[in-house]
């Protein structure tokens, strides 16, 4: 039962995890007009890794898309395929975990196919959120850089009167969500790593249970079932007999009415 | 179409106080700032403040900060300017103009005229 | 703030003539998210309220005559009135509408002879 949870919470946790990745790479706002001293301001600047957005204090906003691919700078390109990366791992492995929740019976797919899957989704989920993570914070880096380069260049060129005020960014909301997200994906891909070493039956699983069927004794001994490491199924683990006793574990393995096929 | 309809002219005694109210039809008065500008005889136009009737928030020149306040009434589409401890430095032609795109006052009232005299 | 200067303070001229006034700003108007310049034009014509002619330092407003143009970058802006006519008797005034407070210029009276 304590497998089933924890597959069960990875799977969610990681389904929020990539759900928050997917909208921090679509927000606008990776980094905002820094409003240093002063808290009001007439035009307001943000940006984000597909366009820039400019809102007016009449509530005016104009968006422009960043039309070009090779103008851009290298450390934006290379968050934008961070995210994408993220995203696409993320995604495959949400679908892998799909099949490989406990509480899906699909045909006659054993335990250990189900084990190699939650462990392959866990690995998926794990780098997902490092892609993630890493991507928010190389941008989070290129914005302090660019943040204290600006402000030693606060006031350049003034001639005479006339002052260029240059616009400073700070971190943008997109970042939080993004490292949150991250994380998210994170632990739940861990908990799915998790889950799979509780899925993967063990030697020390069944005592040794004498069955009688149909006039013949057949019994399940002890090394019966391994571990499997691979992918894929194996046909040597495969279980013949319906017995009357089973692991906690195993009770939820036996079709029922509420089963998706 | 946008009509901005400002109440009539006042004559006030100094350290009186007045308020004066801008009428809105024909847009949704809760989603546009509404600006106050005045302009005394024979000089220039001066930004008091600007209220956003949506949720009340205000902006102000400091210059009328204290002497100016601004509200306004959803429900009847009207901004007002509440202008306290009036002086003769006061007397002035008080409009109200809309917030639009761009930045812009692109409607004003026709403006009220508040004379300070004893 | 910002301060508007606008010169020439007044100026007389013929109609059909083309009439140029100028406007500087203390920081630049210029914001870099959009490269658009937040500088305004307004005339205001004797008894009246004050009626916007452009944004965006030279975006017309729907209805201004094409006489009317805008120009300018940064801190340097121009209103140029191409062929004045008659009814373009009025006071023109530029107006900061980058940061707050909004700040206008002092106005140019224009005169016709």
């Known amino acids: 039962m304590a497998v089933t949870a924890c597959q069960g919470l990875g799977f969610v946790v990681s389904l929020i995890g990539i759900a928050g990745i997917i909208a921090a790479t679509c927000m606008d706002q990776w980094s905002t007009q820094d409003l240093y001293n002063n808290p009001v301001t007439a035009v307001f600047n943000y940006q984000g890794l597909w366009r820039s957005c400019v809102r007016e204090s009449s509530g005016f906003t104009e968006c422009r898309g960043y039309f070009t691919l090779l103008g851009l700078p290298a450390m934006l390109q290379a968050v934008r395929a961070l995210m994408i990366v993220g995203i696409v791992l993320g995604a495959i492995g949400l679908l892998v975990s799909i099949f490989a929740l406990k509480c899906i019976r699909i045909g006659s797919m054993e335990d250990s196919a189900k084990a190699n899957m939650t462990l392959t989704s866990g690995i998926m989920f794990i780098v997902s959120g490092l892609c993630a993570i890493a991507g928010v914070s190389v941008f989070a880096n290129m914005l302090v850089t660019n943040f204290w380069m600006s402000t030693a260049n606060m006031y350049t060129g003034m001639g005479g009167m006339v002052q260029t005020v240059q616009t400073r960014y700070t971190f943008g909301a997109a970042l939080f969500v993004g490292w949150v997200a991250g994380g998210l994906t994170l632990i739940g891909g861990v908990m799915m790593c998790i889950a799979c070493r509780g899925l993967a039956p063990e030697e020390t699983n069944y005592k040794a249970v004498s069955y009688h069927a149909s006039g013949h004794s057949v019994a399940y001994k002890p090394g019966g079932f391994k571990a499997s490491t691979g992918f894929g199924s194996n046909t040597k683990n495969k279980k013949i007999y319906d017995g009357g006793a089973r692991t906690e574990d195993e009770v939820q393995s036996y079709p029922s009415k509420h089963d998706y096929v | 179409q946008v009509q901005l309809q400002q109440s009539g002219a006042e004559l006030v005694k100094p350290g009186a106080s007045v308020k004066i109210s801008c009428k809105a039809s024909?847009?949704?008065?809760?989603?546009?700032?509404m600006n106050w500008v005045n302009q005394r005889p024979g000089k220039g136009l001066e930004w008091i403040g600007q209220i956003y009737p949506g949720n009340g928030n205000t902006n102000y020149n400091g210059g009328f900060k204290g002497k100016a306040t601004l509200t306004a009434d959803k429900s009847s589409s009207t901004a007002y300017m509440h202008l306290n401890s009036l002086t003769s430095e006061d007397s002035a032609v008080y409009f109200c103009?809309?917030?639009?795109?761009?930045?812009?006052?692109?409607?004003w009232g026709q403006g009220t005229s508040v004379t300070v005299s004893s | 703030d910002i301060v508007m200067t606008q010169s020439p303070s007044s100026l007389t001229v013929t109609a059909g003539e083309k009439v140029t006034m100028s406007c500087k700003s203390s920081?630049?108007?210029?914001?870099?998210?959009?490269?658009?310049?937040?500088l305004t034009w307004y005339q205001q014509k004797p008894g009246q309220p004050p009626k916007l002619l452009i944004y965006w330092a030279s975006t017309r407003e729907s209805g201004v005559p094409d006489r009317f143009t805008g120009s300018g970058s940064g801190t340097d802006f121009t209103l140029t009135i191409s062929s004045v006519q008659a009814e373009d008797l009025a006071v023109y005034y530029c107006?900061?509408?980058?940061?707050?407070?909004?700040?206008f210029g002092s106005g140019t009276k224009l005169e016709i002879k």
């Open positions: 107006q900061n509408v980058y940061s707050y407070p909004i700040t």
């Open positions: 920081q630049s108007l210029l914001n870099s998210g959009n490269q658009k310049n937040y």
């Open positions: 024909g847009y949704a008065f809760s989603n546009y700032w």
């Open positions: 103009a809309r917030w639009g795109t761009g930045n812009t006052m692109d409607y």
